[in-house]
């Protein structure tokens, strides 16, 4: 299926930038891995590079405004031609759900006292209004609540006295448009404005005075330009050469608005001064290699020794990483393929342990399934031996840091019947649905 092809992918927003054009295949668009594509206008933007997880979105608002609720965030597998970690296809969303609380308590309504007495009428002649008030204290609201309805009410009152009203002009209305937009036409251009005797109108009984002066005025329009001349396009120029040596590019034709040139504010030529066409070199662009994440550390050993586990003997271990995705003469990965460090092996060593404090509450699992729960733990944490933190293995090479490596066997006193982990679980409340934000825009 044809796609819309773009020259840039903006990592921060996940948006496609720099439209190259439509009607090309994904394979042709992605000859250049810096490009990106959309299956439909306004749809999800996918970069042409190998797939990887986007940044996590911000947490959505808490599902309730008071007491405990839940909130979601997501990230998306973006890229083309491959999978993200977890063997997941591009376009897939991964969700996290956590508990939240915007406000501990929920608002409670209050109740009104009785109405107070009516205040005097607001005017001394004709009709006005009078007001009475009540207090929100029967009982008072709690936790930011309020009383339903209004704290005051008004009603009409009549003094039975007639007021005279003298006329006054309302403000002038706007000047009417000039009777012509440019000078040199058949009629002298004029503009007019008017006003009403309505601010207020004079009363009849008792009689008020009318407004003094005229209700309209007229003047000659000044500063009008000479009448305009519309612009017209010249012919299209030659097509520019394809500007890229690999993937898709864009060629251009140009024309000038000079047949005739617009004059005296006449409109510029309608339409575009340039038009573009996609050109296809059919040559894949170089793809630089990217390091995979580091592998696991190898076991901590010392040459010519069977085992150094549980002993104050420093050893060495290494880990490696793979340079993936390099194609079409792209750059090799910079940096080392192997990492070596010094270590003490505590693999399977019985060590005295102590119970940790409670961990923070974890995420709610499963985030997109029924009855998600969150958990926290206390772990039996090993007390590491007091071996020297640095060693000098070879003369003249200085001190090297030494890291503990391996899974020891910590021993703690039993806690709630457990020897290694004590876990507490709680349900997550008011859980929202995992809904693709791209779908909500459709």
């Amino acid at each position: 299926d044809p796609v819309l092809c773009f020259t840039q992918y903006e990592e921060s927003s996940g948006k496609c930038k720099g439209l190259l054009g439509g009607g090309v295949s994904v394979e042709d668009c992605c000859l250049n891995t810096a490009f990106a594509y959309q299956k439909r206008s306004g749809g999800l933007c996918q970069p042409c590079r190998s797939p990887r997880w986007s940044l996590w979105s911000t947490w959505a608002p808490c599902s309730v405004t008071c007491s405990e609720g839940s909130q979601l965030r997501y990230r998306r597998c973006v890229g083309w031609n491959g999978q993200c970690s977890g063997k997941v296809a591009p376009g897939t969303l991964e969700w996290q759900l956590q508990a939240c609380e915007d406000q501990q308590c929920c608002p409670e309504m209050g109740g009104w006292s009785g109405w107070g007495p009516w205040e005097p009428c607001s005017v001394t002649c004709s009709k006005g209004t009078r007001t009475r008030r009540r207090a929100c204290n029967h009982p008072a609201p709690k936790c930011g609540g309020h009383c339903p309805g209004q704290a005051q009410e008004s009603e009409a009152c009549d003094t039975q006295q007639v007021c005279p009203t003298h006329g006054a002009w309302a403000t002038w209305g706007p000047w009417t448009p000039c009777s012509a937009s440019c000078h040199g036409g058949p009629h002298e251009p004029k503009e007019t404005r008017s006003r009403k005797c309505s601010a207020p109108e004079p009363s009849q009984k008792p009689p008020g005075k009318p407004c003094p002066g005229l209700a309209y005025e007229q003047r000659r329009c000044t500063g009008l330009p000479p009448c305009p001349v519309a612009g017209g396009w010249g012919p299209w120029g030659p097509v520019s050469p394809c500007p890229v040596t690999c993937g898709l590019g864009q060629t251009m034709e140009q024309r000038t608005c000079n047949h005739p040139v617009p004059q005296h504010g006449g409109p510029f030529c309608a339409g575009d001064a340039t038009r573009t066409h996609i050109c296809n070199t059919a040559v894949p662009c170089p793809v630089d290699g990217e390091w995979d994440s580091w592998g696991e550390w190898s076991p901590c050993i010392r040459r010519n020794m069977k085992s150094i586990s549980c002993q104050e003997i420093p050893g060495q271990q290494s880990r490696g990483r793979t340079c993936r995705g390099r194609k079409f003469d792209g750059h090799r990965c910079a940096g080392q393929q192997q990492d070596i460090r010094h270590c003490y092996s505590i693999q399977h060593c019985p060590l005295k342990g102590s119970w940790s404090e409670w961990s923070t509450w974890g995420l709610c699992m499963p985030p997109c399934g029924p009855n998600p729960t969150r958990a926290r733990q206390r772990l039996c944490t090993p007390l590491l031996p007091k071996y020297p933190p640095t060693v000098s293995m070879v003369e003249g090479q200085g001190e090297k840091n030494v890291t503990f490596w391996g899974r020891p066997l910590p021993r703690c006193e039993e806690l709630q019947g457990q020897k290694l982990v004590v876990e507490e679980k709680r349900p997550c409340l008011h859980v929202p649905a995992c809904k693709d934000p791209e779908e909500e825009e459709l």
Epitope: R76, T92, E94, C368, G369, A433, E439
Partner: nanobody
Framework: QVRLVESGGGLVQAGDSLRLSCAAS????????MGWFRQAPGKEREFVAA????????YYADSVKGRFTISRDNAKNTVYLQMNSLKPEDTAAYYC??????????????????????WGQGTQVTVSS
Amino acid sequence: QVRLVESGGGLVQAGDSLRLSCAASGRTLSSYAMGWFRQAPGKEREFVAATTWRDTSTYYADSVKGRFTISRDNAKNTVYLQMNSLKPEDTAAYYCAAEEPSKYSGRDYYMMGDSYDYWGQGTQVTVSS
């Protein structure tokens, strides 16, 4: 363990309708995302339709959009595929699939067969012209 059994397939004329059922035993289907896939002889397995566990989203292949509808009856522990205006190119074995509640979602995720944990044995649909 979830066991899925499809039924409702058969031989129909072009333009006719069929309703496929997928009954589950072992666990309640209401907490699973459910999908229908099909495979014609000599062709790869193809996504047809899917619905998320709360039915907040349903997804369809472009080739069946507007003709097929996926739905579920939690009380009967069954998922359905209502197929209207059938065409000869809809001829295939139809499979029902269930996905354990997970941290993933999205159209592209549910279109992938690898996203599902349990599969039925399939039911044959043949549409003659």
